[in-house]
């Protein structure tokens, strides 16, 4: 009598994650009587994939009706394949007995699973940094197979070079992850800038996946301060302005001090945006010169985005202002930028 053969015609099968995989197996003879079982892997640690007689295998179905008389086709279909299903599958014939005895195994079919990378997620620094500082952005993508992948970083369309990228694990695995860190030098013009992480993989139809982050989430642009005096008004009042320019984000508190005493505090809100994404704000303080005997030291104190306050002081020379109306004598600006 001819020796029974278990034929697995494909050495290897490749499928995309989410698809179904058909693993073919035929036997050359109906004799001896006994079941066919499918296993993943060989040896004592092998995993039972399909057994017609018993067990619950929700994702595995027989291609032919195995209960049909004279059936010699024991091919199976595995639905909704994931990278975790990769491995070598063996179709094994048993001789009926108590217990059944393994008789012959097919040569095995290696199932390879191709899986797309997940959409890259870009995260920036936890705290804002000021211009001329370098911040790090991280990009992560998971679940892809095979391992080969390319990742590029761009800032406003220009590729970044200060990049460190790792694909894990280093050895063979059912799927892989990539993590990349890019170091970006911030400039005052970066409020509207964007970094893009671009991932290319064989499973993507020519178009890389992209993750983005806005530098507006990472940057702080400290304000410039300028205090100036307008000409004296007819009612002996001097109008002093504090111009706070080119700052980001908008979170800003301005306090006027007269001779060291708090005169007024204001919070910036609903400011119009400059073209570069920064903000400007102007605050006015009216000083009644006739109410003062000595020169008045005015300080514009700005606290921006929780940072230490920045001061700009200005002296109004009372002696320079005759008390009669109509005087238009200029006040002296003795101010400098001071930090508390």
């Amino acid at each position: 009598e001819e020796e029974l053969q278990v034929i697995q015609p494909e050495k290897s099968v490749s499928v995309a994650a989410g698809d179904s995989a058909t693993l073919n197996c035929t036997v050359s003879s109906l004799i001896p009587v006994g079941p066919i079982q499918w296993f993943r892997g060989a040896g004592p640690g092998r995993e039972l994939i399909y057994n017609l007689k018993e067990g619950h295998f929700p994702r595995v179905t027989a291609v032919s009706d195995p209960t049909k008389r004279n059936n010699m086709d024991f091919s199976i279909r595995i639905s909704n394949i994931t990278p975790a299903d990769a491995g070598t599958y063996y179709c094994v014939k048993f001789r009926k007995g108590s217990p059944d005895v393994e008789l012959k195994s097919g040569a095995g079919t290696e199932l390879s699973v191709r899986a797309k990378p997940s959409a890259p997620v870009v995260s920036g620094p936890a705290v804002r940094a000021t211009a001329e500082h370098t911040v790090s952005f991280t990009c992560e993508s998971h679940g892809f197979s095979p391992r080969d992948i390319t990742l590029k970083w761009f800032k406003n369309g220009n590729e970044l070079s200060d990049v460190q990228t790792n694909v894990d694990p280093a050895g063979k695995s059912v799927s892989y992850s990539i993590r990349s860190t890019a170091r970006v030098l911030l400039t005052r013009r970066d409020v509207h800038s964007q970094v893009i992480c671009e991932v290319a993989h064989v499973t993507l139809q020519g178009d890389p996946l992209r993750g983005t982050a806005n530098l507006s989430e990472a940057i702080r642009v400290p304000p410039f301060l300028e205090v100036t005096q307008q000409s004296m008004r007819a009612d002996n009042q001097v109008n002093v302005t504090c111009q706070v320019t080119k700052f980001y984000p908008q979170r800003l508190q301005l306090t006027w001090l007269e001779n060291g005493n708090v005169s007024r505090t204001e919070m910036a809100s609903a400011l119009p945006e400059n073209k570069d994404g920064t903000y400007n704000w102007t605050s006015w303080l009216l000083v009644n010169v006739s109410a003062h005997r000595d020169d008045v030291k005015l300080t514009c104190q700005v606290e921006h985005d929780g940072q230490p306050a920045v001061n700009k002081s200005f002296s109004v020379k009372v002696s320079a202002h005759p008390k009669e109306q109509g005087s238009n004598t200029a006040a002296e600006n003795t101010g400098t930028n001071e930090r508390n």
Partner: antibody, heavy 116, light 109 residues
Framework: VQLVESGGRLGQPGTPLTLSCTVS????????MGWFRQAPGKGLEYIGI?????SPYYASWVNGRFTISKTSTTMDLKMNSLRSEDTATYFC?????????????WGPGTLVTVSS | DIQMTQSPSSLSASVGDRVTITCRAS??????LAWYQQKPGKAPKLLIY???FLYSGVPSRFSGSGSGTDFTLTISSLQPEDFATYYC???????????FGQGTKVEIK
């Protein structure tokens, strides 16, 4: 699933020519498509691809001589200025469902002859 | 650019022979290699992708192996319909470009 090239003809050096690849049975917005050529008695040569979203990529030798574009059912190859060495059969092909590393469906080809 | 060197450029064989064609890449392409069969006046037909995976409908006498830089296409028992030209084609995952070998013509001895 079918691809058919058209537009091949006798053309004069220095003149432009546009080839088309008409597809049926699948959507061009789901697959990378490629153009290839084969000079008489020679091997296959890669020209370029167009991604599922419509971004073209070219072989390094193309140097702006060819332009690949597509509509919903056709992919075009515009040859800006024909040269005698462009005489070849031009094939369009679609990448496989598992990835962009191989082409599983090919058109029958269209012949371009460049001669004065 | 990656160069693909196919050998031999031609071979003569008889029906039933075992035929081996090799393809060497100038740098590693991992397993991104496909094999095509082309007959005169016809379009190429895919045989093998990812170095070793048999495309659906292709007879099992065709097999592929290799990874990195060295690849092999084997026809275990040559049939009359197998007389054709065979091409290897690489895809480089970094440059995302394709390169073909120069072809191997399999003729009847």
């Amino acid at each position: 699933v079918q691809l058919v090239e058209s537009g091949g003809r006798l053309g004069q050096p220095g003149t432009p020519l546009t080839l088309s690849c008409t597809v049926s049975g699948f959507s061009l917005s789901s697959y990378v498509m490629g153009w290839f050529r084969q000079a008489p008695g020679k091997g296959l040569e890669y020209i370029g691809i167009i991604s599922s979203s419509g971004s073209p990529y070219y072989a390094s030798w193309v140097n702006g001589r060819f332009t690949i574009s597509k509509t919903s059912t056709t992919m075009d190859l515009k040859m800006n200025s024909l040269r005698s060495e462009d005489t070849a059969t031009y094939f369009c092909a679609r990448v496989g469902p598992l990835g962009v590393d191989y082409f599983n469906i090919w058109g029958p080809g269209t012949l371009v002859t460049v001669s004065s | 650019d990656i160069q693909m060197t196919q050998s031999p450029s031609s071979l003569s064989a008889s029906v039933g022979d075992r035929v081996t064609i090799t393809c060497r890449a100038s740098q590693s392409i991992n397993s991104y290699l496909a094999w095509y069969q082309q007959k005169p006046g016809k379009a190429p037909k895919l045989l093998i992708y990812s170095a070793s995976f048999l495309y659906s409908g292709v007879p099992s006498r065709f097999s592929g192996s290799g990874s990195g830089t060295d690849f092999t296409l084997t026809i275990s028992s040559l049939q009359p319909e197998d007389f054709a030209t065979y091409y290897c084609q690489s895809w480089h995952y970094i440059s995302r470009s394709y390169t073909f070998g120069q072809g191997t013509k399999v003729e009847i001895k």
